[in-house]
């Protein structure tokens, strides 16, 4: 239940965290599960325990096995297991599946690749990054803190990325490498039932008689390109063009905007030289797409 797989390469540093939650003040005891032999805490040992961490500096293939950690919290001792496997270094470039950390996906907007497990180590920037064993060069690649940023991601950027860094322990340096796959996904669009952002339902808009007034109908329809989406105004349930009042006009063309990545449309209704009879009309903002139609009603009132 409370078991965690950890792996590393021989002659590299490997640091494993106890899979049970602890607190800084609670001691953690580590044991070799098979022999129940306690793991020393003295840093002069190649394998030693340091609180919640078990350190192999450096690791050897023979270190492979199950390790028990016991968090000595009050009330209950919390027991966890670390299943450690140390592999021989590969002579070729190919990174086998068993050495791979979880795959991450990126897109044009988000192309961060985090270096796995790096937070467990005492390392200093910069990180070195490799793709399919080739050192990454060029202005598109930026090593930032514990992650790699790729600008203008393309499908060709998919592949296996390896981060390499140095862990420092009491003045001694140890190399660490970690590899994960990166896939590039297309930004998937979607459509949803129209959401009218403005005007609010049953809004009362104050206007001055004799002045011009503008009403904006604004709605969002989903993400990405929308195949059928429109916003329009109606007067007393009639299309503006059929209403026959030249002072009241819809703005030609619909402005497309992206709010929080959503595809949105605006339509402005312009009323020139507002008259008393305009206050008696019902103004409907309509938003429609393949999912259906949503209507918000506005009425005008005289500004005092």
């Amino acid at each position: 239940k409370f078991s965690k797989q950890s792996w590393g390469l021989e002659n590299e540093a490997l640091i494993v965290r106890c899979p049970r939650q602890g607190k800084p003040s609670y001691t953690v005891d580590w044991y070799y599960s098979q022999t129940n032999k306690s793991i020393p805490t003295q840093e002069r040992n190649r394998v030693f325990a340091s609180g919640q961490l078990l350190k192999f500096l450096p690791a050897e293939v023979a270190d492979s096995g199950i390790y028990t950690c016991i968090v000595r919290s009050p009330t209950f001792n919390r027991t966890g297991y670390a299943n450690v496997t140390i592999y021989k270094k590969q002579s070729d470039c190919n990174v086998p599946d068993y050495l791979m950390y979880s795959t991450v996906s990126g897109s044009e907007k988000n192309s961060k690749i985090y270096c796995p497990t790096i937070d467990l180590y005492n390392w200093t920037a910069p990180l070195e990054w490799f793709k399919n064993c080739q050192a990454l060069q060029g202005s598109r690649y930026r090593a930032h803190k514990s992650f790699l940023v790729i600008d203008n991601v393309m499908t060709e950027d998919a592949g296996d990325y390896t981060c390499k860094f140095i862990h420092n322990e009491n003045g001694a340096n140890y190399s660490v490498t970690a590899t994960r796959s990166f896939t590039v996904k297309d930004e998937q669009g979607f459509s949803l039932f129209p959401v009218i952002g403005a005007p609010a339902q049953n809004e009362i808009k104050e206007v001055e008689i004799g002045k011009n007034a503008n009403l904006t109908c604004s709605a969002c329809f989903g993400k990405g390109t929308q195949f059928l989406a429109a916003v329009l105004w109606q007067l007393n349930g009639t299309k503006i063009t059929d209403f026959g009042e030249p002072r009241i006009q819809q703005e030609e063309g619909q402005n497309q905007s992206f709010s929080n990545g959503l595809a949105c449309l605006d339509m402005v209704l312009r009323i020139a030289d507002v008259k008393e009879e305009d206050l008696l009309l019902q103004y409907d903002c309509l938003a429609l797409n393949l999912h259906g139609l949503r209507r918000h009603t506005v009425r005008l009132s005289r500004k005092n």
Partner: antibody, heavy 123, light 111 residues
Framework: EVQLVESGGGLVQPGGSLRLSCAAS????????MHWVRQVPGKGLEWISS???????YYPGSVKGRFTISRENARNSLYLQMNSLRAGDTAVYYC?????????????????WGQGTTVTVSS | NIVMTQTPLSLSVTPGQPASISCKSS???????????LFWYLQKPGQPPQLLIY???NRFSGVPDRFSGSGSGTDFTLKISRVEAEDVGVYSC????????FGPGTKVDIK
Amino acid sequence: EVQLVESGGGLVQPGGSLRLSCAASGFTFSTFDMHWVRQVPGKGLEWISSIDTEGDTYYPGSVKGRFTISRENARNSLYLQMNSLRAGDTAVYYCTRGEDWSDDDYYYGLDVWGQGTTVTVSS
Amino acid sequence: NIVMTQTPLSLSVTPGQPASISCKSSQSLLHSDGKTYLFWYLQKPGQPPQLLIYGVSNRFSGVPDRFSGSGSGTDFTLKISRVEAEDVGVYSCMQSLQLFTFGPGTKVDIK
């Protein structure tokens, strides 16, 4: 306001089963260990079950194998499934809050208690 | 299992007078983190227990300063400097070093 409200108590025959619930509010339920403590009328308090934030469970010998504690963090709820009930299980059952694992500082013991729910095992 | 004992098991006190309850554990309640896991509770009639003291001597929020806790290792004491009518009920000590065990309780009433 931090609150624990127990429910599910009642009269049950020996050998029967009962499921107690505890609804938590006013705090981040998922970061706390949670416990059940019971009190036989006119007697002292007895710890009967615990579940930690990671889902590990703990019981004294008197109820082990008969009682099962569980939690549903999404619902801020704690449960106690009681099977093979005996007359000696008749008590007021309290849900109580324990250690906060989001706070590295002090541990306040069982600092918040519900009002309790009464379980009576009788034929 | 750690066993908790309390003395006395009942206590009648005159309002305004001090009161003292002793609690002993069958083994030291000092944890490797340097803290001692001993708590005091008051259970008023018809109510659930309420925390008074945590970590031997720390008053829980809202607890009047007439309540104080002391002790170390296996011997602990709860003192009420001036007993008030609202202090009646059963006082129990609890350890949480290894699982939880409660003392049998001390019933305090007013003379």
